[in-house]
């Protein structure tokens, strides 16, 4: 059965947008005006995982690209990467765990927790133009809260 997906953009709680930084990395920076067109559009798919009223498992693909955010161990540390997949097989309802994020809604803000590495979250730095990464702390210096903007397909 086909997986449900929607197109969206994400901004962190400081209103930084996410843009491509090289072929396999995202960075967060403030954009204005026409530069807003640079921000990446995600295809957010609703997939297998732990689901409750405020927690929904999703996969985050880049719209019209065969790239998905995934969480893997690199040098024994949970790491966020953009992973290339076979577009014939993705997205699917039952994605590998490394592609799955628990989208958690708290006070109109969203957190994206790795299903593969519980308590690790998609994060941005306070500083401008830094890579989007997987962080193991909430409520510290790094930003783990996002807002989502729907994009018409």
């Amino acid at each position: 059965a086909p997986v449900r997906s929607l197109n969206c953009t994400l901004r962190d709680s400081q209103q930084k947008s996410l843009v491509m930084s090289g072929p396999y990395e995202l960075k967060a920076l403030h954009l204005q005006g026409q530069d807003m067109e640079q921000q990446v559009v995600f295809s957010m798919s609703f997939v297998q995982g732990e689901e409750s009223n405020d927690k929904i498992p999703v996969a985050l693909g880049l719209k019209e690209k065969n790239l998905y955010l995934s969480c893997v161990l690199k040098d024994d540390k949970p790491t966020l990467q953009l992973e290339s997949v076979d577009p014939k097989n993705y997205p699917k309802k039952k994605m590998e765990k490394r592609f799955v994020f628990n989208k958690i809604e708290i006070n109109n803000k969203l957190e994206f927790e790795s299903a593969q590495f519980p308590n690790w979250y998609i994060s941005t730095s306070q500083a401008e133009n830094m890579p989007v990464f997987l962080g193991g702390t909430k409520g510290g210096q790094d930003i783990t809260d996002f807002t989502m903007q729907f994009v018409s397909s």
Epitope: A1, Q48, E96
Partner: antibody, heavy 119, light 107 residues
């Protein structure tokens, strides 16, 4: 409390078509996937396929050419059809619900129907 | 032939810990589920999403999943835990059950 009640012919001859129906009582029908699983006597479980309320299906590749799963949302029922049966299709057939709250796995099962294929 | 491999049988004394394994290629990158089935009954879900227990399942049931192996652990095994146990996951968009493990509680 969710209940799945299933029925259908229990004795078939080789080459006939197996037909089973499962009725769902309690809970929403449209929020779940609905599956069929079978278990030959004394053996393990085999997933047959699933359907959602819109009629979208996934099938086990080893059975795909013979299997049809259909849905009747007006009656909260779904059905299994397996064509050209042989003795190897003798099994207890179960219907089950796949729920998002349990990670889209099978959390409620029917009571099972023994289907015997014999000439 | 099943893509998920389980030992056919496991024996344990009452009160001891039983471990039932399920192995499959890169199983740890998928979600694993476990079912308990007693003779003449329909299967019952005991572990979902690797390590979560449905309501009504005793705390002595736990699960883990990494690498190529998922494990169902029953601590303080009781006589009523004697049953067949099946692991369950997906492979290439369809569902797969392991071959099943008969858990015998000795004595």
């Amino acid at each position: 409390q969710v209940q799945l009640q299933q029925w259908g012919a229990g004795l078939l001859k080789p080459s006939e078509t197996l037909s089973l129906t499962c009725a769902v009582y309690g809970g929403s029908f449209s929020d779940y996937y609905w599956s069929w699983i079978r278990q030959p006597p004394g053996k393990g479980l085999e997933w047959i396929g699933e359907i959602d309320h819109s009629g979208s299906t996934n099938y086990n590749p080893s059975l795909k050419s013979r299997v049809t799963i259909s849905v009747d949302t007006s009656r909260n029922q779904f059905s299994l059809s397996l064509s050209s049966v042989t003795a190897a299709d003798t099994a207890v057939y179960y219907c089950a619900r796949a729920s998002p709250s349990s990670g889209w796995t099978l959390d409620y099962w029917g009571q099972g129907t023994l289907v015997t294929v014999s000439s | 032939q099943s893509v998920l491999t389980q030992p056919p049988s496991v024996s344990v004394s009452p009160g001891q810990t039983a471990s039932i394994t399920c192995s499959g290629d890169k199983l740890g990158d998928k979600f694993a589920f476990w079912y308990q089935q007693k003779p003449g009954q329909s299967p019952v879900l005991v572990i979902y999403l690797d390590n979560k227990r449905p309501s009504g399942i005793p705390e002595r049931f736990s699960g883990s999943n990494s690498g190529n192996t998922a494990t169902l652990t029953i601590s303080g095994t009781q006589a009523l835990d004697e049953a067949d146990y099946y692991c369950y996951a997906w492979d290439n968009a369809y569902e797969v059950f392991g071959g099943g493990t008969k858990l015998t509680v000795l004595g």
